[in-house]
């Protein structure tokens, strides 16, 4: 999906008002210095591409993020503010949802959500030069 036509300011507002809090809740009990940020993004469409991938694509050691509250809210925000997103993405993530087993919070998942927090922070500051 091409995130170029999304309403970035509205997505940012949804992140600041609700998604960010759910990410913090998920990471509660974890030190902010525990994980290094290894995933980066260069602009807002790129950030949303990386956020979409890390949130909804199962990875080795963490196959269970799509049912988390922050993930459902991310999906809702993208569905509302990115025209055409639902048609191209929702059915695929719902198919994965059916295949997935029970929710397990592994260290790998915590690391992945830490990366997500970094991507969202970068999404919110698009004018900053890439480090």
């Amino acid at each position: 999906y091409d995130f170029t036509n999304c309403d970035f300011e509205k997505i940012k507002a949804a992140y600041l008002s609700t998604i960010s809090k759910d990410l913090i809740t998920y990471m509660s009990g974890t030190k902010s210095t525990e994980f290094n940020n290894t995933v980066s993004c260069s602009n807002r469409p790129h950030c949303l591409t990386e956020i979409q991938s890390l949130t909804f694509n199962p990875t080795a050691g963490c196959a269970s993020l799509a049912k988390e509250m922050f993930a459902m809210k991310t999906k809702a925000a993208l569905a509302i503010w990115c025209p055409g997103y639902s048609e191209t993405q929702i059915n695929a993530t719902q198919a994965m949802k059916k295949r997935r087993k029970r929710k397990v919070t592994t260290n790998k998942c915590l690391e992945q959500v830490s990366q997500l927090q970094g991507l969202w922070r970068r999404f919110n500051r698009p004018l900053l030069k890439q480090q």
Partner: antibody
Framework: QVQLVQSGAEVKKPGSSVKVSCKAS????????ISWVRQAPGQGLEWLGV????????IYAEKFQGRVTITADTSTSTAYMELSSLRSEDTAVYYC?????????????WGQGTLVTVSS | QSALTQPPSASGSPGQSVTISCTGT?????????VSWYQQHPGKAPKLMIY???KRPSGVPDRFSGSKSGNTASLTVSGLQAEDEADYYC???????????FGGGTKLTVL
């Protein structure tokens, strides 16, 4: 049973406000969109706005911006639509309608409608 | 803010096919595959018949079909039956600000 149940008919004076409720049951209220659509006597359907409780997002039709307020109480699975500065042209049946999960612009479940009459 | 344009009436005999058109712009029907159709009998709430241009919700007979070409969407009812007599409304997503437009409605009469 999956349904939307709306509050009863209202008679209001011009210039006043009306608040209509819509109680959802049988589905996870928060992750759907709840839209409000009205139909004046003998006229077509007119979309007023939508709320997606999951992310607390509301979007209003330009025509009603500033005059309509849509809210939701997830603890009771109830959505509300308040229309202010009522005039006679606002006399209509007001429907709440469920927008499909993540496809909020398709209304697959409707309330029974609430008749709002504006008359002096 | 303008509604989508539908003919006010359409008719056909039992067993025949009838097509109802719905014309918009590149900002709504032409820009997205997010067209839906609703059936409304007198005194009743509308019922979703078609969504995503041509998909039918479960329980809707396959006599109802939808299509789109450019800025115009169409609903075809084939094998007309008496119970198909109703008002039909098209609807289209119209962007993140406007969200939804309805057509003015078409009264379908089964002769």
């Amino acid at each position: 049973q999956v349904q939307l149940v709306q509050s009863g008919a209202e008679v209001k004076k011009p210039g006043s406000s009306v608040k209509v409720s819509c109680k959802a049951s049988g589905f996870t209220f928060g992750s759907y969109g709840i839209s409000w659509v009205r139909q004046a006597p003998g006229q077509g359907l007119e979309w007023l706005g939508v709320i997606v409780p999951l992310v607390d997002v509301t979007i209003y039709a330009e025509k009603f911006q500033g005059r309509v307020t849509i809210t939701a109480d997830t603890s009771t699975s109830t959505a509300y639509m308040e229309l202010s500065s009522l005039r006679s042209e606002d006399t209509a049946v007001y429907y709440c309608a469920r927008g499909q999960e993540y496809f909020y612009w398709y209304f697959d479940l409707w309330g029974q409608g609430t008749l709002v009459t504006v008359s002096s | 803010q303008s509604a989508l344009t539908q003919p006010p009436s359409a008719s056909g005999s039992p067993g025949q096919s009838v097509t109802i058109s719905c014309t918009g712009t590149i900002s709504d029907i032409g820009g997205y595959n997010r067209v839906s159709w609703y059936q409304q009998h007198p005194g009743k709430a509308p019922k979703l018949m078609i969504y995503e241009v041509s998909k039918r919700p479960s329980g809707v007979p396959d006599r109802f079909s939808g299509s789109k070409s450019g800025n115009t969407a169409s609903l075809t009812v084939s094998g007309l039956q008496a119970e198909d007599e109703a008002d039909y409304y098209c609807s289209s997503y119209a962007g993140t600000d406007t969200f939804v437009f309805f057509g003015g409605g078409t009264k379908l009469t089964v002769l």
